[in-house]
C-alpha cells in the first residue's frame, strides 16, 4: 500500500503488564508488536542506553518478526528498565518494561489478611470484593462462588459446587483481577465468595460472605440521601 504511516502498536494487550518479577534462571520475553508503513525497525534500550549483546552473559535474542526481546537464564544484573523503540521515517514510539529478578525463596501466594471482607447490600445495589495477592512467582488468580444445585451445596462426592466468576486471562490485568464487582445485586448473589491465588509452589485462598437485604420501600427510596447505606 502507498499509505505512509508512522509506527503504531498492533496488540496493546500483550504490553499491559509492565512489571515482570521473574525468578532467577528463568527466561524473559518482552514484546512490542507494531505496524507502520514502511515497516518500522525495532531496537532495545536498557536503562535508557543502547542494549548490546556484550552487556549480559549469553547475550540475548531479538525476534524481529515477533517484535520480541528474549533473555534466557536471567540473573540479578539483568534487573532494570527495558525500552523498545519502534521507528520509521514517519515517527517513533516506545514502550518500557521493568524487570525484577527474584532471588529469594519462592513461596505460596500470600493473601492480605481480612481481604476479601464480608459485605452486605440491598437488592439492586452494587458491591465489590477486593483481594490483595503477594507472590514471588506470577500468580494465577480466580474468583469463585459457592453455588447450589438442586438445593444442595455439595455434590454426591462430598465436594462443593463451585462456579468460576472471574479468572486472569490474556486480556485481564493484575489490577483488574484483584477486584470482583457485582452490579445490580439479587438475592441469588448472596453466599460465599472465594479469592484463589496459585503459583508453582501452591494455592492459597480467602473467602468472604455477601449478605443481600431487601430493598427499602419506594417512599424511603425517594427521600433517602444517596449515602443512606453507610
Amino acid at each position: 500500500s502507498n499509505n505512509k504511516r508512522a509506527p503504531y502498536w498492533t496488540n496493546t494487550e500483550k504490553m499491559e503488564k509492565r512489571l515482570h518479577a521473574v525468578p532467577a534462571a528463568n527466561t524473559v520475553k518482552f514484546r512490542c508488536p507494531a505496524g507502520g508503513n514502511p515497516m518500522p525497525t525495532m531496537r532495545w534500550l536498557k536503562n535508557g542506553k543502547e542494549f548490546k549483546q556484550e552487556h549480559r552473559i549469553g547475550g540475548y535474542k531479538v525476534r524481529n518478526q515477533h517484535w520480541s526481546l528474549i533473555m534466557e537464564s536471567v540473573v540479578p544484573s539483568d534487573k532494570g528498565n527495558y525500552t523498545c523503540v519502534v521507528e520509521n521515517e514517519y515517527g517513533s514510539i516506545n514502550h518500557t518494561y521493568h524487570l525484577d529478578v527474584v532471588e529469594r525463596s519462592p513461596h505460596r501466594p500470600i493473601l492480605q489478611a481480612g481481604l476479601p471482607a464480608n459485605a452486605s447490600t440491598v437488592v439492586g445495589g452494587d458491591v465489590e470484593f477486593v483481594c490483595k495477592v503477594y507472590s514471588d512467582a506470577q500468580p494465577h488468580i480466580q474468583w469463585i462462588k459457592h453455588v447450589e444445585k438442586n438445593g444442595s451445596k455439595y455434590g454426591p462426592d462430598g465436594l462443593p459446587y463451585l462456579k468460576v466468576l472471574k479468572a486472569a486471562g490474556v486480556n485481564t490485568t493484575d489490577k483488574e483481577i484483584e477486584v470482583l464487582y457485582i452490579r445490580n445485586v439479587t438475592f441469588e448473589d448472596a453466599g460465599e465468595y472465594t479469592c484463589l491465588a496459585g503459583n508453582s509452589i501452591g494455592i492459597s485462598f480467602h473467602s468472604a460472605w455477601l449478605t443481600v437485604l431487601p430493598a427499602p420501600g419506594r417512599e424511603k427510596e425517594i427521600t433517602a440521601s444517596p449515602d443512606y447505606l453507610e
Epitope: S105, L162, S200, I201, G202, I203
Partner: antibody, heavy 124, light 112 residues
Framework: EVQLLESGGGVVQPGRSLRLSCAAS????????MHWVRQAPGKGLEWVAV????????YYADSVKGRFTISRDNSKNTLSLQMNSLRVEDTAIYYC?????????????????WGQGTMVTVSS | DIVMTQSPDSLAVSLGERATISCTSS???????????VYWYQQKPGQPPKLLIY???NRFSGVPDRFSGSGSRTDFTLTISSLQAEDVAVYYC?????????FGGGTKVEIK
C-alpha cells in the same frame, strides 16, 4: 487412573548428560505444576525442581542449579529433566511428582501423586 | 532454606501399640491462609512415598484412621494409634510452604 511414569534412567559417566521423561495420564496435565524429587540409595528425599503449569516459572535446588533443566510439553503430557555435567552425587532414584493445580481444591494442592521412579547411576 | 528435623531416626513398637514421630521446622509453617503446610509420607522398600497427612492434620483419601497428624507452627507429630504389621516403613515429614521444598531425614518404624 491418575498415573506418572518416569523413563530415561541409566548408568552414565561423570560429566556426561542424561534426559529423564515423565509421561502423565488420567488428569489434565496442563493445569498442574510438576516437580522432580530424588532419593540417593539408602538416603532420604531431596526436592530437585519445579515447573509451573504453563512452563513460565522454574525453580531449582542449589545442588542442581545451572546443570539441570526442567521442561514440559503440554501437548504430549510430558515432563522432562535434562541433566548435564552429572556428578557421582547425582546418583539416585528420580521421581516425578504432581504439584499444585490451577483451581480450587478440597484435598491437598499437590504432592499427592508420585511416579514409580527411574534410577540414575553416575559412575566412572 | 527451611530445615526439617525428624526424631527419632528409628522406632521399634509392639503390634497394637502407639508409635509417635516428631518433626520440627526451622521456621513457622503456618501460612497467611490459616493452614499449616506440613505433609507426612510413608515409604516402603522399593516403592515411592505415599501421602498420609496433608496440611498438618488432614488424612489423605484411603488412609486408615489410625494415622493422625497434629502440632502447630514449628512442632509436628505423626501418630500411629495402633501399629499394624503393614505399617513397617520409613516416614517423612515435608514442608510445602516455599521452595526449596524440604523433607525430614526420615524415621524407620519397625516391630518390637
Amino acid at each position: 487412573e491418575v498415573q506418572l511414569l518416569e523413563s530415561g534412567g541409566g548408568v552414565v559417566q561423570p560429566g556426561r548428560s542424561l534426559r529423564l521423561s515423565c509421561a502423565a495420564s488420567g488428569f489434565t496435565f496442563s493445569s498442574y505444576a510438576m516437580h522432580w524429587v530424588r532419593q540417593a540409595p539408602g538416603k532420604g528425599l531431596e526436592w530437585v525442581a519445579v515447573i509451573s503449569y504453563d512452563g513460565s516459572n522454574k525453580y531449582y535446588a542449589d545442588s542442581v542449579k545451572g546443570r539441570f533443566t526442567i521442561s514440559r510439553d503440554n501437548s504430549k503430557n510430558t515432563l522432562s529433566l535434562q541433566m548435564n555435567s552429572l556428578r557421582v552425587e547425582d546418583t539416585a532414584i528420580y521421581y516425578c511428582v504432581r504439584g499444585a493445580g490451577r483451581g480450587y481444591t478440597y484435598g491437598p494442592d499437590g504432592f499427592d501423586i508420585w511416579g514409580q521412579g527411574t534410577m540414575v547411576t553416575v559412575s566412572s | 532454606d527451611i530445615v526439617m528435623t525428624q526424631s527419632p531416626d528409628s522406632l521399634a513398637v509392639s503390634l497394637g501399640e502407639r508409635a509417635t514421630i516428631s518433626c520440627t521446622s526451622s521456621r513457622s509453617l503456618l501460612h497467611s491462609d490459616g493452614k499449616t503446610y506440613v505433609y507426612w509420607y510413608q515409604q516402603k522398600p522399593g516403592q515411592p512415598p505415599k501421602l498420609l497427612i496433608y496440611e498438618l492434620s488432614n488424612r489423605f483419601s484411603g488412609v486408615p484412621d489410625r494415622f493422625s497428624g497434629s502440632g502447630s507452627r514449628t512442632d509436628f507429630t505423626l501418630t500411629i494409634s495402633s501399629l499394624q504389621a503393614e505399617d513397617v516403613a520409613v516416614y517423612y515429614c515435608m514442608q510445602y510452604i516455599e521452595a526449596p521444598l524440604t523433607f525430614g531425614g526420615g524415621t524407620k518404624v519397625e516391630i518390637k
